[in-house]
Interface confidence: low
């Protein structure tokens, strides 16, 4: 676009301009080529010879313009057409500037300390007769010239006359500029354009409002000569929270929302999320939602899963070893990464469950106590005439780093019993007579600790050959036996349970099985022998 | 035996660096997800930061978010803090814990961090 | 940030008495709260898990209470080596968050 400096048309007052010698330029009235009225400027001082008419504009501003345009329209009269004037008529005119940094006032044109810089001598391409000013025929010339680059606020032109019969119509003054404008959400300047014939300018944007740049490296273009823009390069993206509508950013609405500039358009926020305000960055989970720290603002919010569904475990009593196995929780909490840990407490045999400590170190987990993707667990190192509370509890990625303690755990309780804690190699043969056997064992329970006292060992023994139906039994209360009417020299088959009285009694299983062969007839005992 | 053993405490200016170490031993260290705490001088105990056994998932107090990072290498048996920019108000003794599901049920000595010019 | 608030922040017992030592949450934990004692010079010890569970090695008189956002610790009759410092401490949120303390001193 172009940006006016001066233009002598659109003055509809005197323009007051200075001339010297006062016989010289003179303003006048007149129209234009639409019959607008105009202020023009004219001499025809052609008869005389030795003109040196001057005629001074007033100051005109350059405003941020370095290269100016001047464009002139004038008349000019044909030397030949006038008699008398061929040796002092002229038909060109000369055109000057005078930079200065304020108005030198209405007075004698200053026209500076040094000479005013010449921009042109200006001819005429067309010029009218006197036939032609009797029929009306103003054959109008227009003229542009380029001055500066200009350093100073602002300049004076200044019009020589120096013998011919012009008129100046109008007088333009100004400089081109890119206009302002808006590309790539960056804002540019209204810049003004160099000359043709220098480089391109250019100028840093800068991002609208609620948008950002590459860090360092602000969008840019240039500023052509004819003031276009060219050469976009680089642009603003909007900020998070943020999107693009035409120019500007908007801020996402509600149930919407941006994390980075790198996106172009607001989200609806993830399914269990709310952005409640405008221009957020992130959805907030609803409650009992959230995210983990690996999840992207772009995941669902999830929540904890259900405790583990069907939690079954299985007991064997020699070893003494704990089997659990559980189907997944019914709701996973909108996650794939369950996983599953386990807690050990051991309770006192009687009382409340609450009456539990953690298991210790002694107990040990297969595969692992916590972390498990498996679906199964194994527990070692129980101790016997114990009861056993294992929470499994399921996690995923939002259950936080104690959430095993919360409630989306299930539970067993376990009472590994006295059972028949005893290897094969645990119970002894003290004894070995033709008609009797004499065995002992580990008590299951320390001397001395809860339940010690009350235990009861049930022997059941049979011919080894015969059906395990036909076995005869022996009871005792201490952790030795001694079985008699045996036979002699034959294979026998003890068992062995240990339990207190009561109703468990049942439940307990005979194991280990040893083998003894009583002594023929003609054999003396064998005391303390190894073990078997 | 269970232990835990702390080292990497120190004085340093503000704005400095520090990194606290946490060797285990006597249990299965990637079983179980590790704390620090810290105790400013004279004070009561803060939890700083916690890391899941895998290494997986990492939470951290607001008073260092940012600037504090949690990890562990499981082939070593170690936990660490690396701690940045830190503060005056970062001076303290900062203890590992052991996350024994649900409390902390091993505790590191601690080690002294003094941050000082 | 659940914030825990102990109270008294001391209290002054003699030998063989009852101490009660209270602990309130601004939000309710459920039962995720834990009591630890805390001597001078030494990490802290687990004392009380899942607000009413005793841990390993810890005397049937220290005793826990409380659900949701009101708790206590009770240790019915005091002996020397419990006077200490104790501290709550939730875990029912990823912000773990320990109480002020109350330092139990003998009277």
């Known amino acids: 676009e172009e940006v006016i400096l001066l233009d002598s048309k659109a003055s509809q007052a005197e323009l007051g301009w200075t001339a010297l010698p006062s016989n010289g330029w003179e303003e006048i009235s007149g129209v234009d080529e639409h019959d607008r009225p105009i202020r023009t400027y004219q001499v025809c001082n052609v008869l005389e010879p030795n003109q040196d008419n001057w005629l001074q504009t007033g100051w005109i501003s350059r405003g941020r313009g370095q290269r100016i345009f001047v464009e002139l329209q004038f008349t000019l009269r044909d030397c030949s057409s006038i008699p008398g004037a061929a040796g002092t008529c002229k038909e060109t005119f000369n055109v000057y500037y005078l930079e200065t940094e304020a108005d030198l006032g209405r007075g004698r044109p200053r026209l500076g300390g040094s000479r005013p810089r010449k921009i042109d001598t200006i001819a005429a391409d067309e010029s009218f007769t006197q036939g032609d000013l009797g029929e009306r025929k103003m054959k109008l010339n227009t003229e542009v010239r380029e001055i500066g680059p200009l350093s100073r606020r602002g300049f004076h032109l200044a019009f020589q006359d120096v013998g011919a019969c012009v008129a100046l119509v109008s007088v333009r003054v100004y400089y081109k500029q890119c206009r302002a404008t808006v590309r790539g959400l960056a804002t540019f300047p209204a810049t003004a354009a160099e000359s043709a014939f220098s480089t391109l300018v250019e100028v840093a944007g800068t991002c609208v409002a609620h948008s950002e740049g590459e860090p360092g490296s602000p969008p840019r273009m240039h500023c052509g000569a004819d003031g276009e823009w060219l050469v976009p390069v680089g642009r603003c993206s909007c900020s998070a929270g943020f999107q693009e509508r035409g120019d500007f950013c908007e801020a996402c609405p509600p149930g919407f929302y941006k994390v980075s500039p790198r996106r172009p358009l607001c989200s609806p926020c993830p399914e269990h999320s709310r952005a409640l305000e405008n221009a957020s960055t992130f959805c907030v989970c609803q409650d009992s939602y959230a995210r983990s720290p690996t999840d992207p603002p772009s995941a669902s919010c999830t929540r904890p899963p259900s405790a583990p569904r069907d939690l079954q475990y299985s007991l064997s009593r020699s070893p003494l070893v704990l089997r659990l196995r559980w189907l997944p929780p019914a709701d996973s909490g909108g996650r794939s990464d369950v996983t599953y840990s386990l807690l050990c407490l051991r309770c006192g045999r009687e009382g409340p469950a609450g009456a539990c400590e953690p298991c210790g170190p002694r107990v040990a987990f297969l595969p692992r106590q916590a972390g498990l993707r498996e679906r199964a667990a194994t527990l070692l190192h129980l101790r016997p005439g114990a009861r056993y509370t294992v929470r499994v509890a399921a996690l995923n990625g939002v259950s936080g780093p104690a959430a095993a303690a919360g409630t989306t755990y299930a539970q067993v309780t376990v009472s590994t019993g006295p059972g028949a804690p005893w290897e094969e190699d645990e119970i002894r043969r003290d004894r070995v007579e033709p008609q009797s056997v004499s065995l002992s064992w580990r008590e299951p329970i320390p001397a001395g600790a809860p339940g010690a006292n009350d235990t009861e060992y049930e022997i059941r023994y049979y011919e080894k050959g015969q059906s395990e139906q036909t076995y005869s039994m022996v009871k005792t209360g201490a952790p030795t036996v001694t079985v008699t009417n045996l036979k002699p020299a034959t294979r026998y088959v003890f068992q062995i349970r240990a339990a207190s009285p009561g109703p468990s009694w049942e439940a307990q299983s005979f194991n280990p099985s040893i083998e003894v062969q009583t002594l023929g007839e003609a054999a003396s005992g064998s005391r303390d022998q190894s073990p078997a | 035996e269970v232990q835990l053993v702390q080292s990497g405490g120190g004085v340093v200016q503000p704005g400095g660096s520090l990194r606290l170490s946490c060797a285990a031993s006597g249990f299965t260290f990637d079983d179980y997800a590790m704390h620090w705490v810290r105790q400013a001088p004279g004070k009561g105990l803060e939890w700083v930061a916690v890391?899941?056994?895998?290494?997986?998932?990492?939470y951290y107090a607001d008073s260092v978010k940012g600037r504090f990072t949690i990890s562990r290498d499981n082939s070593k048996n170690t936990l660490y803090l690396q701690m940045n920019s830190l503060r005056a108000e970062d001076t303290a003794v900062y203890y590992c814990?052991?996350?024994?599901?649900?409390?902390?049920?091993?505790w590191g000595k601690g080690t002294l961090v003094t941050v000082s010019s | 940030e659940i914030v825990l608030t102990q109270s008294p922040a001391t209290l002054s017992v003699s030998p063989g008495e009852r101490a009660i030592l209270s602990c309130r949450a601004s939000?309710?934990?459920?039962?995720?709260l834990a009591w630890y004692q805390q001597k001078p010079g030494q990490p802290p010890r687990l004392v009380i898990y899942?607000?009413?569970s005793r841990a390993t090695g810890i005397p049937a008189r220290f005793s826990g209470s409380g659900s949701g956002t009101d708790f206590t610790l009770t240790i019915s009759s005091l002996e020397p080596e419990d006077f200490a410092a104790y501290y709550c401490?939730?875990?029912?949120?990823?912000?773990?968050?320990f109480g002020g303390g109350t330092k139990l001193e003998i009277k």
């Open positions: 401490q939730q875990y029912g949120s990823s912000q773990l968050t």
């Open positions: 890391i899941s056994y895998d290494g997986s998932n990492k």
């Open positions: 814990a052991r996350d024994g599901l649900p409390a902390f049920d091993i």
């Open positions: 899942d607000a009413s």
């Open positions: 939000q309710s934990v459920r039962s995720n």
